[in-house]
Amino acid sequence: TIQGTNRSSKGRSLIGKVDGTSHVTGKGVTVETVFSVDEFSASVLTGKLTTVFLPIVYTIVFVVGLPSNGMALWVFLFRTKKKHPAVIYMANLALADLLSVIWFPLKIAYHIHGNNWIYGEALCNVLIGFFYGNMYCSILFMTCLSVQRYWVIVNPMGHSRKKANIAIGISLAIWLLILLVTIPLYVVKQTIFIPALNITTCHDVLPEQLLVGDMFNYFLSLAIGVFLFPAFLTASAYVLMIRMLRSSAMDENSEKKRKRAIKLIVTVLAMYLICFTPSNLLLVVHYFLIKSQGQSHVYALYIVALCLSTLNSCIDPFVYYFVSHDFRDHAKNALLCRSVRTVKQMQVSLTSKKHSRKSSSYSSSSTTVKTSY
């Protein structure tokens, strides 16, 4: 969002009346409250970055993210017999992605039509709430998954049912936390009419009267509490995991698991570098600049960073692939247009393969041989 200028003589409270049209005069409208943006922001709002690049990225995210996360959720809920903690966290991750991605057609249409929101205030708030909710949910569930992966290596034996219940409890707590922290995004009016551009923006312009200081404090708090702290936990878990893997015994099976673990670590690292770090950093910098200078010089970068943050919905399926054997099977077969049942029937006679699958449990369980959650 950029800072808009509220031209209302009434001023504006945190949840006040922002814009409205009183009557039409000629070809234009007479607005009761009006917001003005600086020229650079206007050029971004009307330029190819927001009207071409963003819709392309969001279309890719929608086309890839919807089926892959949909399939993942289906696999974790109906095709995975043992609901291990990792499966629970991944199911929640897939659900978070789906809840965000399903609104993307509206987002795509909004940008294609020159950043003009025609779907009403409520839908804009839902879109924004789910957008940020997904990012912070992804960070937290990824952290849980990472810590859990490490914990399995350190403590391979444990009560599965108890662990699953804990994972469910943690997941519910995360959803509740995200619901609470995103309340301001649902409460604050997000749509604003810009008379100079003749468009109604959704979240892209917020008035200066919205108390930019509050927005800065809000995103700074989220960046510290829901990004930096979980990022530190995730990094610690993977550093310790790499150490453990280095010192573990080196048979063929362990080597496979190690490679998969490294792929998982690289995927999560890529997600942090592409999706989470730029967006959280630029959210803070952007609002700091508005708070201190009244305008943001990083607006274009901020827009791109937020756009890239949605790529986590495309990267998450790779995490499922490296962690879940069931998802890996279904993904391979979906890509090869085969049914899992057919493949399993083919495998019945091959006892050696069957045995190897029982013992290769990193993917759905841990990084040590023949251990479960």
Epitope: G28, V37, P195, A196, E208
Partner: antibody
Framework: QVQLVQSGAEVKKPGSSVKVSCKAS????????ISWVRQAPGQGLEWMGV???????YYAQKFQGRVTITADESTSTAYMELSSLRSEDTAVYYC?????????????WGQGTLVTVSS | EIVLTQSPATLSLSPGERATLSCRAS??????LDWYQQKPGQAPRLLIY???SLATGIPARFSGSGSGRDFTLTISSLEPEDFAVYYC????????FGGGTKVEIK
């Protein structure tokens, strides 16, 4: 060069309306906004309203319901009509060019039109 | 509504002297403040925009400074044609003008 030429002085009766014109040259009305500012004798400047190049308008709360700003792109002319005139509306009315964005000032002004409201 | 208070109301100076005009906003307006000069019977003329940017064709003796709530227009050395009324105007939230400062010959 950029110029804003306003219509001549007007004497009006209380309760009537006045329509002041502002002819633009040297730039396109579709790319700029025109703001209207008034100045009562011996007083300061008071902002009244604005019309953007796309036809959207916004008026100061004080004048809402009494002022109407329009523009005719074909003649490059902006108009400001003030109705229900009172003696306190006696002032010099100025039109000013504005780029329409937050970081722009009113860079060019018309010469002003004196409107006298007297019975 | 943001209120702009200009001080002093009148400034009596001689040509060649330095003039310092002040404009204080009732709330933070960042750098969104412009300065105008108005001579009797004439329209206002833009001098400074966005607190410190010099408008086209304005002599370098005019300079602006400040941000937030306090702003200053400085005329380094007064020329005879500089004696006029100066207005500040904010465009952060609405468009409002200050009451003006009259710079007169001492």
């Amino acid at each position: 060069q950029v110029q804003l030429v306003q219509s001549g002085a007007e004497v009006k009766k209380p309760g009537s309306s006045v329509k002041v014109s502002c002819k633009a040259s040297g730039f396109s009305l579709s790319s700029y906004a025109i703001s209207w500012v008034r100045q009562a004798p011996g007083q300061g400047l008071e902002w009244m309203g604005v019309i953007w190049g796309n036809g959207n308008t916004y008026y100061a709360q004080k004048f809402q319901g009494r002022v109407t700003i329009t523009a005719d792109e074909s003649t490059s002319t902006a108009y400001m009509e003030l109705s229900s005139l009172r003696s306190e509306d006696t002032a010099v009315y100025y039109c000013a060019r504005w780029r329409g964005f937050k970081d722009y000032p009113f860079d060019y002004w018309g010469q002003g039109t004196l409107v006298t409201v007297s019975s | 509504e943001i209120v702009l208070t200009q001080s002093p109301a009148t400034l009596s100076l001689s040509p060649g002297e330095r003039a310092t005009l002040s404009c204080r906003a009732s709330q933070n307006i960042y750098k969104w403040l412009d300065w105008y000069q108005q001579k009797p019977g004439q329209a206002p003329r833009l001098l400074i925009y966005n607190a410190y940017s010099l408008a086209t064709g304005i002599p370098a003796r005019f300079s602006g400074s400040g941000s937030g709530r306090d702003f200053t227009l400085t005329i380094s050395s007064l020329e005879p044609e500089d004696f006029a009324v100066y207005y500040c105007q904010q465009h952060n939230s609405g468009w409002t003008f200050g009451g003006g400062t009259k710079v007169e010959i001492k």
